[in-house]
């Protein structure tokens, strides 16, 4: 049976949704973006151990074979599976602009 | 500028579409499918350095966010960005039908 | 918490210049942006347009350019707002609002709202 | 610049009612809009950002919904603290432009 959201591993070791506080600078963009100076970047991360949040048939596939052949196939990995949309104010040649971001902040996390 | 799909690790070393040949057994699917019984499972394996393959603002946030953090944020990790559909043949309660799965079998890599 | 706390009301005469301040508290000043807007009694809310301390950089409403200057005092953590040649339809309240943290085009948290009167 | 159209203009509602309000865009903006309640003499307050995120805080009753240039604000069940004006915003674009406002009364 799928134990979808309980960890194996213990609290808070698993795939889930961090927050990560980062400045322009910290993120290479202080040359462009005028606006916020400061994210709270969200972003998964932990282990993808059997069974938890697997996205899909591939990623039950990768861990079955991870098991098989460690050195060769990778555990799944704990990425988006949707994001928050986010706007940021940029410089541009012609002055300042709204622009605005699909894929920037993530949302929830499974593994893949 | 972006390398894009340039390895900068070398051939083959980065996030690219592997094949592993598997049989049912390998993959568990031994007690529900009926064929085939070996799979070609294409997957993505390899490393994902600076620009390689981003799939998005997400990732380049999350590479800078590693080289300043690398024992709080993980590197970017190499995930399909599509899949190849595959059908099965299957045991039904009812006897054996054809199964269709749109998330199999990767198709193309990039980095998130 | 984060707060912005704005000047009191004001009572001006056609012609006249007024500047509004709004003094922000609880996170740092200059890593978000204040925009501007207003509301005629009665009415619904206008933007009248954004600073960010960091830079200074501005955007103004197509309508009030000119006429409006927007400036921010990063020693006190203080933006202000001044407009001139005033009119009697400038007669509103005037709110600060920082950009919100999720996305630099929402706003929130707001001032408290500034009353601005313009009368001969 | 982008017009933003609200609708209706006021709606009468009781206690524990389901209440819908609309916003059209005149352009395509996305998902970026945004939701304020406002309380006669008091300023706004930020409740829904592009267009479906819960400002941190708001109650679970309120809901946005929408893309493109169609968006929608619903409140489940209708408590008193929720008489008020509401407005939408677009956030695509400068300038920022509000719609008219939605005023919910008691019925």
């Known amino acids: 049976a799928r134990n979808g959201d309980r960890c194996p591993l213990g609290p808070g070791r698993c795939c889930r949704l961090h927050t990560v506080h980062a400045s322009l600078e910290d993120l290479g963009w202080a040359d462009w973006v005028l606006s916020p100076r400061e994210v709270q970047v969200t972003m998964c991360i932990g282990a993808c151990p059997s069974q938890f949040r697997e996205a899909n048939m591939h990623a039950q596939i990768k861990m079955n074979l991870h098991r098989l052949k460690p050195d060769t196939v990778p555990a799944p990995c704990c990425v988006p599976a949707s994001y928050n949309p986010m706007v940021l104010i940029q410089k541009t040649d012609t002055g300042v602009s709204l622009q605005t971001y699909d894929d920037l902040l993530a949302k929830d996390c499974h593994c893949v | 500028a972006r390398n894009g799909d340039r390895c900068p690790l070398g051939p083959g070393r980065c996030c690219r579409l592997h094949t592993v040949h598997a049989s049912l057994e390998d993959l568990g699917w031994a007690d529900w499918v009926l064929s085939p019984r070996e799979v070609q499972v294409t997957m993505c394996i390899g490393a994902c350095p600076s620009q390689f393959r981003e799939a998005n603002m997400h990732a380049q946030i999350k590479m800078n966010l590693h080289r300043l953090k690398p024992d709080t944020v993980p590197a970017p990790c190499c995930v399909p960005a599509s899949y190849n559909p595959m059908v099965l043949i299957q045991k039904t309660d009812t006897g054996v039908s054809l199964q269709t799965y749109d998330d199999l079998l990767a198709k193309d890599c990039h980095c998130v | 918490q984060v707060q912005l706390v704005q000047s009191g009301a004001e009572v001006k005469k056609p012609g006249a210049t007024v500047k509004v301040s709004c003094k922000a508290s609880?996170?740092?000043?200059?890593?978000?942006?204040i925009h501007w807007v207003r509301q005629a009694p009665g009415q619904g809310l206008e933007w009248m347009g954004w600073i960010t301390a960091y830079s200074g950089d501005t955007v103004y409403a197509q309508k009030l350019q000119g006429r409006v200057t927007m400036t921010t005092d990063t020693s006190t953590s203080t933006a202000y707002m001044e407009l001139r040649s005033l009119r009697s339809d400038d007669t509103a309240v005037y709110y600060c609002?920082?950009?919100?943290?999720?996305?630099?085009?929402?706003?929130?948290?707001w001032g408290q709202g500034t009353l601005v009167t313009v009368s001969s | 610049d982008i017009q933003m159209t609200q609708s209706p203009s006021s709606v009468s509602a009781s206690v524990g009612d389901r209440v819908t309000i609309t916003c059209r865009a005149s352009?395509?903006?996305?998902?970026?809009l945004a939701w304020y309640q406002q309380k006669p003499g008091k300023a706004p307050k930020l409740l829904i950002y592009a267009a479906s995120s819960l400002q941190s805080g708001v109650p679970s009753r309120f809901s946005g919904s929408g893309s493109g240039t169609d968006f929608t604000l619903t409140i489940s069940s209708l408590q008193p603290e929720d008489f008020a004006t509401y407005y939408c915003q677009q956030g695509a674009s400068f300038p920022l432009t509000f719609g008219g406002g939605t005023k919910v009364e008691i019925k």
């Open positions: 352009q395509g903006i996305s998902r970026w």
């Open positions: 609880g996170y740092t000043f200059d890593s978000y942006g």
């Open positions: 609002a920082r950009e919100s943290g999720q996305t630099s085009s929402a706003l929130g948290p």
